[in-house]
Each structure stands twice: as C-alpha cells, then as structure tokens.
C-alpha cells in the first residue's frame, strides 16, 4: 500500500530537451563550396548522436556537380549486410544493394540532391553510414557515425518506508541518476535490453526524520527530467518533537 | 483538481486558544502530507507542522511545539490545527497547503485582541 | 534548520525589463524548492515548481533555474500586472523554510 501511496504524491519536477539535438541535418550550405579537397577530407567521419523518431538528413562532400562522375551512399547497420545506393551521373542511374529499409531514402533524386534521409529515424538505425564521391581528382567522402538516442521513461516510487526507487526505463545510451538529498543507495542496476536500450534503476533509503523530500535527478544525452516525493512518515511515528 | 478550503477569519482574546479548519477535495486525502504556514502582517511565510492523515503522523516546529495540535478527520477529508496560549503576535494569515506544497488554501485571518 | 538567503528584498524595475531574483540555502545543502508569487490580499500562488518546471497557465516569461544550493528566478520582460512579493520555499527538509520574500514594484 505505501508503494501506491507514495506514488500518488510524485510529481515531475523538469523536463527540458538537448534543443543541440533536434537538429535534423548536420548538412553544410551548398554555396559554400569547398575549393580546397584537403579541407573535406579532414572531415571525414563525424559523430553524430540523434534522437530517435526525428527526421535525420546526412550529406556528402560539397563537390561541385559538374565535377562528379559517381555518388555512393555506403549504409553499414548493426546485424545487417552493408547496403549501397549508388548514382551514376553520366547515365543519370540510380542502384540499390542488399537495402531493405523503406525509411533511408535519398533526399530527392540524386542529380539535385546527393543527400540521404532517414525518415523517422528508428533504433536500428545505429550504425555507419558513408558518402562517396567520385571526381577525376580522385574519391571524397564523408562518414557519419550514428547514435541513436533514446529517451528513458522515468518513474519514482515509494516501495517501503522511507526507501525510494527512482528508475529510468528503456534509454539508450544509459541515463545516469542522482538524488537530493543524497541517500543510503544500493549498487545501481542496469538492465540491458535487445533492442540497445537500458533500464537504470537507483534505490535509496534516508533514515533522517528530517528529510521531507526526495528529488530524483535523470541525466540523459536527451534531457534531464527529475521527478520529487514527499516521503511517506516513519512507521509508528506520531508526533516529532525536534527532528531536525 | 485539489481544492483546500478553510473555515472563517477569528476573533480572540490573548490567553485563548483558535482551531482553524482545512477541508481537502480532489485527491487522495490520506496518501498526501498536509502542511500549515502562517503569514503576520506586512511579513513573511512561516511554516508551522505537517500532518500525515494516512497515520496521524505529525511534526511540529520547534517554534510552536508544544502550542500547536494538528489533527485529521478522514471521514470528512478535514484537517485541522489548533492553537492555544494567543498572542498579539499569532495574528495571522493562516494557510494549509498539500501535494508538496503545490495547492493552497485562500487562509483564514486569526486576530489576537484584548 | 535550512536557512534560505533570498535577495534583493525589494527592486524597483521597469516595465520590459528583466529582473532576476536568487535564492540560496544554507550550510551548503542541497535542496529543491518552489517559486512562489504572492498579491496583497491573496494566497501565494505556485509559479515555478521543482526549481524550474513551469506551472500550467503561468506565462512563458517567468522562469527557473539552479540546483543543489543556488537558485534563480526570472521575469524575461515585466509585466504591470507583475508587480508582488516573490517568495522561495526548500521542501526538501524539516522544516520548510521560505526566503525572505522580494518585493518587486514597478517604476
């Protein structure tokens, strides 16, 4: 019963988003053409944390199209054979191999746009994924590692007097957890799932009368949210003189 | 939504003793401590006690330990919070407030005068 | 007891401006606490809880931040109808304890 008690007074403190991360496109501006090949070939692999459920847009080298002959999207996921997608300039032929997910498109086709889309991003998303371009003065490319992160759902509950479990559920990467005011906590457990994601799970107990509330803090590449609950009162206890 | 509503503005004389009244609508009266403040003209909040209705389970400050008595009726969904040995200076706004101090209670005016 | 160390205790802005009020608890303890607005004659209404989440049907323009013993409230660009006393409460230990209040008046 105190379990369901407790978890009638919980309330949610923050929850405020990475807005560095809802950004879909790590794409430069066109115009801004790179003269100088050495320039984007020291930009060749980035990484690339995303959300997952965003729309995400990854972009070649910015070569010039007249100077193209070749662009190839290289797409290497978790489990999965490696897929191309492939664009011949001069017979304005587009190529797929071993490429099954409906979601990574290219932008639109590739003569006026050479870059890729994944279109919601989903967790088996994760994985490398390479432009390719081939010029006379020989191959540019860029490559993205992608992680995707995943939001944990975050719960805090009273499972016995004065001992609170705060849990963040099926993140990716794992959250990590603190408390205010610091408590007698247990080892925190973390259980991983298939998909990649982790469920973080802190237990603590606060034998101090005087300790009203317990705030539970989540740290996330996603956000932070923390979650705060009035303790339920020692057993047996009536009335306090000076607790404090 | 919870609504807290309190009993009407007192009169009484220094010596005497006030019981002010909270009744709680809206949520599970007996899973959420309840708290009272108190507010003297022109001055600051003041926190007095909580009272858990659950279990009866109480804490005073020490400022009025000893003064101050709070109670709770769960068949009515009713706190309460007594006062006794007035003042002049326990005159008052008195406030009860639950859900962590998220929900409040428009107060009840204690006037202590001879 | 948790001391909360509120200031300024009162300011004289203009309308548009930004006011910024701060709260800090005692023996550097971490805690967390409310914001509260409060209007002659009335009971102090909740604006920020839980240090920075806003309250439903409170204006964007208020806000909070901080955590573990500082902490910060905001009114991005004052409003006429702003003009009160503002108040921190710790609800982490007991006692509650509230600052000393700030009253803000409009020039």
């Known amino acids: 019963e105190g379990a369901a008690q407790s978890n009638n007074s919980l309330m949610l403190q923050t929850s405020k988003e990475n807005h560095t991360l809802a950004s879909n496109s790590l794409c430069m501006d066109e115009k801004q053409i790179t003269q100088n090949h050495s320039k984007v070939l020291a930009e060749v692999n980035i990484s690339w944390p995303v959300q997952m459920a965003r729309n995400a847009v990854l972009c070649c080298p910015p070569i010039e199209f007249r100077n193209l002959i070749v662009i190839t999207w290289e797409i290497i996921l978790r489990g999965q054979p490696s897929c191309t997608k492939s664009y011949r300039k001069e017979t304005n032929e587009t190529k797929e191999t071993n490429c099954t997910d409906e979601r990574i498109t290219w932008v639109s086709t590739p003569d006026q746009n050479s870059d890729l889309q994944i279109h919601p991003v989903a967790i088996t998303h994760d994985g490398y994924y390479r432009c390719i371009m081939a010029t006379p003065d020989g191959n540019f490319h860029r490559g993205y590692h992608l992680q995707v992160l995943v939001t944990p759902e975050v719960t805090l509950f009273e499972s016995r007097n004065r001992t609170a479990v705060c849990k963040a559920v099926a993140g990716k990467p794992a959250a990590q957890i603190s408390w205010i005011p610091a408590g007698d906590c247990a080892p925190t457990e973390q259980e991983y799932w298939g998909n990649g994601t982790v469920t973080v799970k802190s237990t603590c107990h606060w034998e101090g009368h005087n300790v009203s509330t317990v705030t539970c803090h989540v740290s996330h590449l996603t956000g932070n949210k923390s979650l705060y609950i009035e303790l339920l009162p020692v057993p047996g206890a009536k009335k306090s003189a000076k607790l404090y | 939504e919870v609504q807290l509503v309190q009993s009407g503005a007192e009169v009484k004389k220094p010596g005497a003793s006030v019981k002010v009244s909270c009744k709680a609508s809206g949520h599970t009266f007996t899973s959420y401590w309840m708290h009272w403040v108190r507010q003297a003209p022109g001055q600051g909040l003041e926190w007095m006690g909580n009272i858990y209705p659950g279990s009866g389970s109480i804490n005073y400050d020490e400022k009025f330990q000893g003064r101050v008595t709070m109670t709770a009726d769960t068949s009515t969904s009713t706190v309460y919070m007594e006062l006794s040995s007035l003042r002049s200076e326990d005159t008052a706004v008195y406030y009860c407030?639950?859900?962590?101090?998220?929900?409040w209670g428009r107060g009840t005016l204690v006037t202590v005068s001879s | 007891d948790i001391q909360m160390t509120q200031s300024p205790s009162s300011l004289s802005v203009s309308v548009g401006d930004r006011v910024t009020i701060t709260c800090q608890a005692s023996q550097g303890t971490p805690i967390n606490l409310h914001w509260f607005q409060q209007k002659p004659g009335k009971a102090p209404k909740l604006l920020i809880s839980?240090?920075?989440n806003l309250e439903s049907g409170v204006p964007s323009r208020f806000s909070g931040s901080g955590s573990g013993t500082e902490f910060t409230f905001t009114i991005s660009s004052l409003q006429p109808e702003d003009a009160a006393t503002y108040y921190c409460?710790?609800?982490?230990?007991?006692?509650?304890?509230f600052g000393q209040g700030t009253k803000l008046e409009i020039k």
């Open positions: 839980g240090a920075s």
């Open positions: 409460l710790q609800f982490t230990y007991i006692p509650w304890t």
């Open positions: 407030l639950t859900m962590t101090g998220t929900s």
